[in-house]
Structure formats: C-alpha cells, structure tokens
C-alpha cells in the first residue's frame, strides 16, 4: 500500500489507477476507516450521505473535501479499462495536524543551585498524532533521569476534536558553580515523519548560589549513644542559622513520624529502637541539611559502651524528605 499523509481539514484526492479518464467506467472504491464498520463500497454513481465525506470524481479519483481523524485507514480502488484489464490501487491514509507553537508557562525566573527546581511547563496544543515534547539546555537535548533532570509528562485528548494537548514539566538540580544564566527551550516533534520540530522561545532563569551553611551539629546524651534497656537517650540538633529551621528526625535513613523538634527524647529504649539517627534541618531559603548520624545501641548491664556513636561523613548532602 502507498502511504499518504494528509493534513486535517484539507482536501485529499486519491487517484484510481487504470480507470478511464471519463465515464462510462467500471470501478469501485473500498474504504476501511474510522467512519466504517469493515469495508464500505463507493461507486461513481454516489449519492447519499457519504457524498459530504467522500465521493468519486468523473475521472474516477476519490475526493475527500476535508480530511478528519476518522478518515485514517485503507482506501482501495479496483478499476477495469476499456480492454478489460484490471488495475488495483491501494492507499494507507494517515492524517496529521501541526499544533500551534509550543509555549513555556509557569517558568521560574530563579533557580537554586544544589537543589531540585521546577524550570517550567511546556505546553503544545492541537497536535495529531500526539507527538512528543523534549527539553533543551543551551541547545543540547536534556535527558530525563540523568544529572538531576526529571520530566513529568501529561497527554490529554480533546473530547470533540480528538486533537492532543501535551504538557511537560521540567525539574533540574543546577550544579553549584555552574552557568549562572542557563538557556532552556522546549520543542515539539510531530508524530508523523517529514515535519520539522517546533521550538519555544527560550527562557533564561538566573541560578542563585546559596551560601554554604554552617554544619548541623547532633549531640547525643549519653555520649556514645549506648544505653541500658529501658533507659533514655536525648538527641539535640544544633543549627546556627537564624531564624530557627524546622527539625525532623531520621532513623536508618527513613523519616521518623514525629512532630518537628530540635530535641528528640527517646525514653524506654528497647531493641527495636537501635539504629542510626540523624536530624534534618529545613530552612525556608535553603534546601534540607542533614547532620551526621549517630548510632544508638543497647548495652546489657556489665558491658562497656562504645566511645563514639558517629557514623558516616559530614552529612552535608541534600535529600528529599518523605
């Protein structure tokens, strides 16, 4: 079958090969499209409601005055010339619609280095088939799930027109000491080949470098974090920053379901409470900051406790709180 692409709303003429140029003609068009159940047969005589959708012209060609999504499918013509020789034409018709130029909405004017930021949402309206949206940084394609890049996509279809609206939300974590004015753009690539991509106007947010924070200190009492069963451990999170940030607590890397507090009192310690504890300070202007982790363990009477309960490094990395 010969592949034909036609723009939605435009006319389409399909030639019936081998058909005499004018009547009388022995030919038959068969259609299997979104408008038909199985095959529909059209003859030169025509007439009826189908004339508004597709009709056979005097030269045997099939004429569709305004192609729609439902006209996608197979079109076949079987014609016999004056000598009785049979010729078959076979077309696969696919339709398309180029959307309006994509746009970036809800774009950020400023990004913070070292933490995830929403850059903006790219929107393309009125495409068929759906096509795809992709993001570019300084002209180079951005690959989702690489180097702090994440993309959330959504595709919606208009209930009446059948055309697609695409949305793509870009989140990035700019590197510290990187480009202070990166250029982001988004492009729409049509689902059908041979149509060029459409690109948005670029956006150039500023990248703000937060001043490195003083380290979050975690103090454990009793020192070393070893306690007898049923004893109490007090963890204090000391943050030099003003105003005081919200302090949450982690155990074995998982958030503890507790109200925010700079002091964590662990009374009546039991075996289930052993593990590594850390605190996370969340500032309104900075990303979250984690303390070192301390190990809490139970010592049976007569045992000597460890001298230091610290594990891991500086704990200055950023992390997402559940």
């Amino acid at each position: 079958a010969q592949n034909i692409t036609a723009r939605i709303g435009e006319p389409l003429v399909l030639k019936c090969k081998g058909a005499p140029k004018k009547p009388p003609q022995r030919l038959e068009w068969k259609l299997n499209t979104g408008r038909t159940e199985a095959w529909k047969v059209l003859s030169p005589q025509g007439g009826g409601p189908w004339d508004s959708v597709a009709r056979v012209l005097p030269n045997g060609s099939l004429f569709l005055p305004a192609v729609g999504i439902q006209d996608e499918g197979i079109f076949r013509c079987q014609a016999m010339n004056r000598n009785g020789k049979e010729t078959k034409s076979n077309y696969r018709v696919r339709v398309y619609q180029i959307p309006g130029k994509p746009e970036i909405v809800d774009s950020a004017s400023e990004l913070t280095a070292g933490v995830p930021n929403k850059v903006g949402t790219c929107v393309s309206e009125g495409s068929y088939p759906a096509g795809t949206l992709s993001w570019h940084l300084d002209g180079k394609p951005l690959v989702p799930n690489e180097k702090g890049v994440s993309v959330k996509e959504q595709t919606r279809r208009h209930p009446e027109t059948g055309l697609f609206t695409l949305q793509s939300e870009l989140m990035v974590t700019p590197a510290r000491g990187g480009d202070p004015r990166p250029t982001f753009s988004c492009s729409f690539s049509p689902g059908l080949p041979r149509h060029r991509a459409l690109r948005t106007a670029p956006i150039q947010p500023r990248v703000w470098e937060p001043v490195p924070l003083e380290e979050v200190q975690l103090v454990v009492e009793p020192e070393g974090g070893a306690v007898a069963p049923g004893g109490t451990v007090t963890l204090t999170c000391e943050v030099p920053a003003q105003p005081s940030p919200q302090i949450h607590w982690m155990k074995d890397g998982v958030p503890l379901p507790l109200p925010p507090s700079p002091v964590l009192i662990l009374p009546e310690i039991g075996p289930q409470d052993q593990g590594t504890y850390s605190c996370v300070a969340t500032h309104s202007s900075h990303g979250p900051q984690e303390s070192r982790a301390v190990s809490i363990s139970i010592i049976e009477p007569g045992e000597e406790g460890p001298t230091a309960g610290s594990v891991g490094g500086s704990g200055l990395g950023t992390l997402a709180l559940a």
């Epitope: 507790l258 925010p260 507090s261 700079p262 009192i265 662990l266 009374p267 039991g270 289930q272 409470d273």
Partner: antibody, heavy 120, light 107 residues
Framework: QVQLQQSGAELVRPGTSVKVSCKAS????????IEWIKQRPGQGLEWIGV????????NHNEKFKVKATLTADKSSSTAYIQLSSLTSDDSAVYFC?????????????WGQGTLVTVSA | DIQMTQSPSSLSASLGERVSLTCRAS??????LNWLQQEPDGTIKRLIY???SLDSGVPKRFSGSRSGSDYSLTISSLESEDFVDYYC?????????FGSGTKLEIK
C-alpha cells in the same frame, strides 16, 4: 503512676468551638508526645494528630488540619485540643494518649476519653 | 495513607477457645504495630507493641505475630473479660491509622 486525666463531657451548639484538656501526671511531661484520637459513636478509631509539648511541634492528619488545633501548657502539664466550626460529624469521644519516638512508648497510655456532643 | 484491613469484624467464641484476629497493612510498616483493647465503658489499653512485645501486666495468653503484611493477635485460651473490642494501630508513617476493629462475643 502515669495518668492522663481528660476533661468532662461537653454539649455544644453547631458552629461553635470546644476545648478538651488532657492533664498528665506521674511522668516528665516534656519527654513524651501527646496523641489525639477520635471515636464516633459505635465506630472505630481515627488519628487526629500529635504534639510535642517540649517544642510545641505538631503533626496533623490532613483531614483534621483545619478542624483541630493542638496545644500544650508545660507549666500545668496539660495538652489541649480545640475543635472549631462544630457540626454533628464532630460528635464523638476524643481520647488523648501518651507516646514517644520509641516502640515501647508509642500509644502506651490512654486517657479515659471526653464525649463531645454537638446539638442544637 | 496506609490502610489497615482488620478481620473478622466480629467473632463468636467460647470460653477456653483459642482465637486469632488479623490486620493486613496496605504498605510496609515493619514492626510498627500495636494491638489495643477497648472495654465497653470506652477504656482503651495497649496489649501488644512493636508487633509482638507484650505490655507489662497483660496476661501471657495474649501474643502478637507477623507474617509478611499480615499481623495477628492470638488469645490462647479465652477468659470472660476478653469479650470486648480489639483494634490494631500502625505507627510507621503519618497519618497513623487503625484497623476497623473486631468485636469478640461469647458464644
């Protein structure tokens, strides 16, 4: 011994608010958390939220974020829940419970409950 | 939110019988589960904490266990004061959630 003594039953009008208290004794009030739980007549239990009396920090069940305000007075070792814009759906028994960040202390002791009836 | 599906909702049993109540967690809660007992007058008492640890003063006939996402409270030999309501409670993550309860009735 640990005790959580709750205030008496309340009969209140729709649209008004009510404050239920939970007085703690027999332990260091600042070292533990107070959880609040709702039980409608003949129904199950629903967690409302928790307060750390030492820091004043709270966490709420999203469902009760607007409805319930949790506070604590360290000087009297008393925790409070204030319920606002009352409707018949708020008619229930409200419990306080003592908790902490350790397994052994989670919801270990319970108050006797306070019945709040909202009626015109 | 984590759903706690408790079964059965009611259970008729005889004195001396062994019974088990179950709660199924919709997400991983580790061992962060309590079993609570509620008397007809509304008094609530914790029986089991951290899935299987018995509270002090609670009779040894009560025990807690876990198999995957299913948590069980077993009473080895029912006594007359055991015919009350029981609830499970998960405290692994906010918001904490309870099972819908089991009413234990005397046959």
């Amino acid at each position: 011994q640990v005790q959580l003594q709750q205030s008496g039953a309340e009969l209140v009008r729709p649209g008004t608010s009510v404050k239920v208290s939970c007085k703690a004794s027999g332990y260091a009030f600042n070292n533990y958390l107070i959880e609040w739980i709702k039980q409608r007549p003949g129904q199950g239990l629903e967690w409302i939220g928790v307060i750390n009396p030492g820091s004043g920090g709270t966490n709420h069940n999203e469902k009760f974020k607007v409805k319930a305000t949790l506070t604590a007075d360290k000087s009297s070792s008393t925790a409070y829940i204030q319920l606002s814009s009352l409707t018949s759906d708020d008619s229930a028994v409200y419990f306080c419970a003592r908790s902490a960040g350790t397994a052994r202390a989670r919801f270990a002791y319970w108050g006797q409950g306070t019945l709040v009836t909202v009626s015109a | 939110d984590i759903q706690m599906t408790q079964s059965p909702s009611s259970l008729s049993a005889s004195l001396g019988e062994r019974v088990s109540l179950t709660c199924r967690a919709s997400q991983d809660i580790g061992s962060s589960l309590n079993w609570l007992q509620q008397e007809p007058d509304g008094t609530i008492k914790r029986l089991i904490y951290a899935t299987s640890s018995l509270d002090s003063g609670v009779p040894k006939r009560f025990s807690g266990s876990r198999s995957g996402s299913d948590y069980s409270l077993t009473i080895s030999s029912l006594e007359s004061e055991d015919f009350v309501d029981y609830y499970c409670l998960q405290y692994a993550s906010f918001p904490f959630t309870f099972g819908s309860g089991t009413k234990l009735e005397i046959k």
